[in-house]
Every structure is written in C-alpha cells, then in structure tokens.
Amino acid sequence: EEELQVIQPEKSVSVAAGESATLNCTATSLIPVGPIQWFRGVGPGRELIYHQKEGHFPRVTPVSDPTKRNNMDFSIRISNITPADAGTYYCVKFRKGSPDVELKSGAGTELSVRAKPS
C-alpha cells in the first residue's frame, strides 16, 4: 500500500493586500478516510484556518468541490488578504475517529502580504 503523502507544492506565496490567496495542497491517496484541515503555525498556538467537514470559515473556500468523489485536491482560497494573514500555512490529513487523529502534514506554505498597489 502506497504511503499517504500531503503535498504543498509552493514553499512561499506572495499576495497583495486586498487580493485572494490560493494555497495549494494535494493528497496522494484517499485512504484512510478522514478530513483535511488547514492550520496556520505549529505548536500550542496552531490556528485552525479551514476544516473540510465542520465550522464556519467565511473568508475561506475550497478550490475544488470537496463533495466530489475521489477528490484529492484540498487547495483553499482565502479572500480579502490583509497583513494580519501573513504566516506559514499547513495542510494536514486526519484519520476519521473520535476525535480525528492527525496523520500527515504538508511541508507548509509561507504567505507574505505585499502593500496594496496605489
């Protein structure tokens, strides 16, 4: 059985304030069953940015249809970027459970925010 990999192809992304940022993530396998979550940062302060199955994330939308069968693209788009959104974002695969169990994290994508063009 091929080992699951979570791939974040871009090490860094730069976006102008006010624009949208696309953070790319793909998984190499649908197995095991369980959600993808996006976080900013690592450790105690790790902040939940998007949960595929639950929660309310008004500025975040999935790039691909998450309900589509066999979807392995877990990229997200964050709208109306501000300097406060800068940081390193991680795409993380969980195994379904109670609670869900973290399986594999992508390497992270650093988002930097440029000043709004005048």
Epitope: G41, V42, P44, G45, R46, I49
Partner: antibody, heavy 116, light 108 residues
C-alpha cells in the same frame, strides 16, 4: 475578547482542583489557549496549552498531574490539577495563544493556594 | 529549553526619561521575542511581538529591537502609567515556551 477564569481556591497538598476559563469575542475552537501561572511575588511560568487542532502541551513540572482540555461548544478551557503541591500555589491566568505562540489576550487570573 | 535573562532586575527612573530593558536568550531565537507589561494586581499585557512589532493599541513610545540572542525594549519618554514589571517571552521554541525573570521599572 474576554477571558474569565474560575475555580481557584484553597486545597491541601495532594488534593485536586479544576480551573475553568470562559472565552468570548472570538471563534474559540479555532485558536490555541493556554494556562500561565505566577507564584506570589515571582515571574510568569507557562504551564499548559491546547492548540486549535486539540493537541495538548505541558511544562515538565506538571506532566502527569495536570490535564488541559476544552469544550468548544461551551467556549471553555479547563485545567484539571491533581496531586497538588505547595509549589503549585500561584495565580493561574488563561491566555489566548497566537498562531506563532505568544499571548495576545489574558484573563484576570484565579488564585490557587496549596497549603495544609 | 531556552533560558531568557533580563537585566537589570530593577530600574529606578524619573518620568520623562528614556528607558532601555534587555533580554538575552541562551540560544538564537530568530527574532521571536515578545514583551509584556504587568502592573500590580493586573494581568500581563502584550506590548511587542516578533521583536519589534507593536501590539494593537500600544503607544508609539514603546519600541522593540534586537536579533540573534540580544533584545531590547525601549520606552522613549516614561509616563507615570509605565511604572510596572516588564517580561520578555520567546516564541521560537514551544517546548516549552519560556519567560524572562522580569524587570521592575520603579519611580526614582
């Protein structure tokens, strides 16, 4: 953002206590939360944290004795403290943790006194 | 564990003076230092993070600088409400997060 701690009090050595921190003004479930303590007349010491993903972290001196947990439906953070020692006497502050691991909002604290 | 050493332990100054507090780390922390102010009977308040970024609502007289292992908090013109204890905290290594021992700024 508001953080309100409760549950402190006087307890004998070896006893237990459960602290609570009720949060408002932000989406609680998305953020890391932490407990930081301050012994009388002393500095600040980080005790424990629960991240936005539910992972838990402890300083060495409380591992195996303290348990941090959260109820996202109640916007509440807990600290279950067992096998309490005199050196655990302190004001316990609840603090919100930023994504890069500093503390941007603090509660007023609750005093825990461990004494016979 | 990263150890933070603050100096001096106590600083006696007059209102209007410029104050510089120092925090030294036992290893490089890539500018990941935060500063807090604590007044008697109150919770700490975030002043500075990432060594030099001011937190929301913090007056411009507070500034942070430094890199590597040595960091400073400067208060350009000390106001009466600035007499307090100041703590640094490293947010580079979270196992564990650590604070300095504090510097008390008192009225001369």
């Amino acid at each position: 953002v508001q953080l309100v701690e409760s549950g402190g009090g006087l307890v004998q050595p070896g006893g237990s206590l459960r602290l609570s921190c009720t949060a408002s003004g932000f989406t609680f479930r998305n953020y890391g939360m932490s407990w930081v303590r301050q012994a009388p007349g002393e500095g600040l010491e980080w005790v424990s944290a629960s991240s936005g993903s539910g992972s838990t972290y402890y300083t060495d001196s409380v591992k195996g004795r303290f348990t941090i947990s959260r109820d996202n439906s109640k916007n509440t953070l807990y600290l279950q403290m067992n096998s309490l020692r005199a050196e655990d006497t302190a004001i316990y502050y609840c603090a919100k943790v930023t994504w890069n691991n500093f503390f941007d909002y603090w509660g007023l604290g609750t005093l825990v006194t461990v004494s016979s | 564990e990263i150890v933070l050493t603050q100096s001096p332990g106590t600083l006696s100054v007059s209102p209007g003076e410029r104050v510089t507090l120092t925090c030294r780390a036992s290893q490089g922390i890539a500018g990941k230092i935060a500063w807090y102010q604590q007044k008697p009977g109150q919770a700490p308040r975030l002043l500075i993070y990432d060594a030099s970024s001011r937190a929301t609502g913090i007056p411009g007289r507070f500034s942070g600088s430094g890199s590597g292992t040595e960091f400073t908090l400067t208060i350009t013109s000390l106001q009466s409400e600035d007499f307090a204890v100041y703590y640094c905290q490293q947010h580079y290594d979270w196992s564990p997060l650590t604070f300095g021992g504090g510097t008390k700024v008192e009225i001369k």
